[in-house]
């Protein structure tokens, strides 16, 4: 998570500005927090949401009157309670289509406070790895975002392909041989946001057994 | 550059067997997957499935499993596709396609092999 | 499997005229694709990353859309984009290339 914090002043209002970077898990719940100041200090607290590919949308509270109003239907997005009991803001069940910036703006007789947060989602990538030829093992981190790093103990002769999906996620694929006859058993170590896995294979004559994680 | 080249035609009978080719040339064979596509005329395309040069890995659309098989001669950079019991639904331009890196999709083409399948 | 459905079938359009065509995708997408097909050749790339177009595509096409709706723009209609357009995905899991249906675009 990367913070940045600004302030600027302006001969009207000042605004203290926050940017921040959250990754969140595909199908899990996000809640996003705005500026920790009390509602009674609050005129207006806005939430602003930029989607890839989509107008952007707004969801606000009028203190004062107690009134809520939104253009973010239908995108799973909402107010994690009432916004008079807390302003965070909640997404139910992340999709790959919440990836975006969201803005909170909470305006004050102070001044404004902004929080930015740039939402990036993850997905835990697919692992698999198999024995293809003699001495040449094949490991795969399917479908992941963002891409995972494969790597080999002990090191081969290798060769890495990434390939992009229109969702957004990208599979790897590493192939590598062992010439010396003296490694017997090989391990293939994917790294990825989400957790690391590493799975092993014994390097048989002929093709052998596939071994799988996810 | 990056050209793959493919015969223009091919005549078949009904029940016989078809091996088409496909051979690339201006970049590195074993580094991006091959497909092939079918498009019978007048009609839409549809993907049959990709092979990696490298070693051989194959996926198949399941409606063309029992149809095609994919193969490479790594040595002369090309790859093959072999289609099986040609009917009258088999009459179609095949085309090879290079897939793999940053696009999720085909940026180079062949021209198209027609096979008809006639008595 | 994603299925994506591409609308009008066939459309006209007068030269100079704007034209868009459609794709739906049954599951939610981050990028579109765009093919274009002239009659006997071979498809040509044409908008990739749903709105970035392919070397030597004219500035008069674009793309657009997000999740499950996206569409092809031609802001001036021109003889040579006469053809079939086809929406593409492609799924890392399971593996699977998609194309629509196609859009044939001719000229009144």
């Known amino acids: 998570t990367d913070k940045n914090q600004t302030t600027q002043n302006n001969s009207s209002s000042p605004l203290t500005q926050v940017n921040t970077t959250v990754s969140v898990q595909i199908g899990t719940k996000a809640l996003l927090c705005c500026f920790s100041i009390p509602l009674t200090k609050a005129v207006l607290i806005t939430w602003i949401i930029k989607l890839r590919g989509l107008p952007s949308c707004t969801i606000a509270y009028k203190v004062d009157t107690k009134t809520n109003e939104t253009s973010c239907l239908g995108r799973n997005i909402t107010w994690a309670s009432t916004p008079d009991h807390s302003p965070e803001l909640q997404i139910s069940a992340v999709t790959l289509q919440h990836e975006g910036t969201y803005t909170c703006e909470t305006v004050t007789p102070e001044g404004n406070f902004e929080k930015n947060y740039d939402l990036q989602v993850l997905v835990t990538p697919e692992v698999t790895l198999f024995q293809n030829r003699n001495r040449t093992a094949v490991c795969k981190a399917v479908a992941g975002k963002p891409a995972a790093h494969i790597s080999w103990i002990p090191e081969g002769d290798c060769a890495t392909k990434q390939e992009y999906w229109s969702n957004g996620t990208v599979t790897v694929k590493s192939t590598c041989h062992w010439e010396v006859h003296n490694v017997s058993t090989v391990t293939c170590h994917v790294s990825h946001l989400t957790g690391n896995k590493s799975l092993y294979i014994e390097l048989l004559p002929v093709p052998g057994a596939k071994k799988s994680a996810k | 550059q990056v050209q793959l080249q493919q015969p223009g035609a091919e005549l078949v009978k009904p029940g016989a067997p078809v091996k088409l080719s496909c051979k690339a040339s201006?970049?590195?064979?074993?580094?991006?997957?091959m497909n092939w596509v079918k498009q019978r005329p007048g009609r839409g395309l549809e993907w049959i499935g990709r092979?990696?040069?490298?070693?051989?890995?194959?996926h198949y659309n399941q409606k063309f499993k029992d149809k095609a098989t994919l193969t490479v001669d790594k040595s002369s950079s090309t790859a093959y596709i072999q289609l099986s019991s040609l009917t009258s639904e088999d009459s179609a331009v095949y085309y090879c396609?290079?897939?793999?890196?940053?696009?999720?999709?085909?940026?180079?083409w062949g021209q198209g092999t027609l096979v008809t399948v006639s008595a | 499997e994603n299925v994506l459905t591409q609308s009008p079938a066939i459309m006209s359009a007068s030269p100079g005229e704007k034209v868009t065509m459609t794709c739906s995708a049954s599951?939610?997408?981050?990028?579109m694709l765009w093919y274009q097909q002239k009659s006997s050749t071979s498809p040509k790339l044409w908008i990739y990353?749903?709105?970035k177009l392919a070397s030597g595509v004219p500035g008069r096409f674009s793309g657009s859309g997000s999740g499950n709706s996206y569409s092809l723009t031609i802001s001036s209609m021109e003889a040579e984009d006469v053809g079939t357009y086809y929406c593409?995905?492609?799924?890392?899991?399971?593996?699977?290339?998609?194309f629509g249906g196609g859009t044939k675009l001719e000229i009144k």
């Open positions: 593409f995905q492609g799924s890392g899991n399971p593996l699977m290339y998609t």
């Open positions: 092979i990696d040069p490298s070693d051989s890995e194959t």
């Open positions: 396609a290079r897939s793999g890196g940053w696009l999720p999709g085909f940026a180079y």
């Open positions: 599951s939610s997408l981050s990028y």
């Open positions: 990353d749903t709105s």
């Open positions: 201006g970049y590195t064979f074993t580094s991006y997957w």
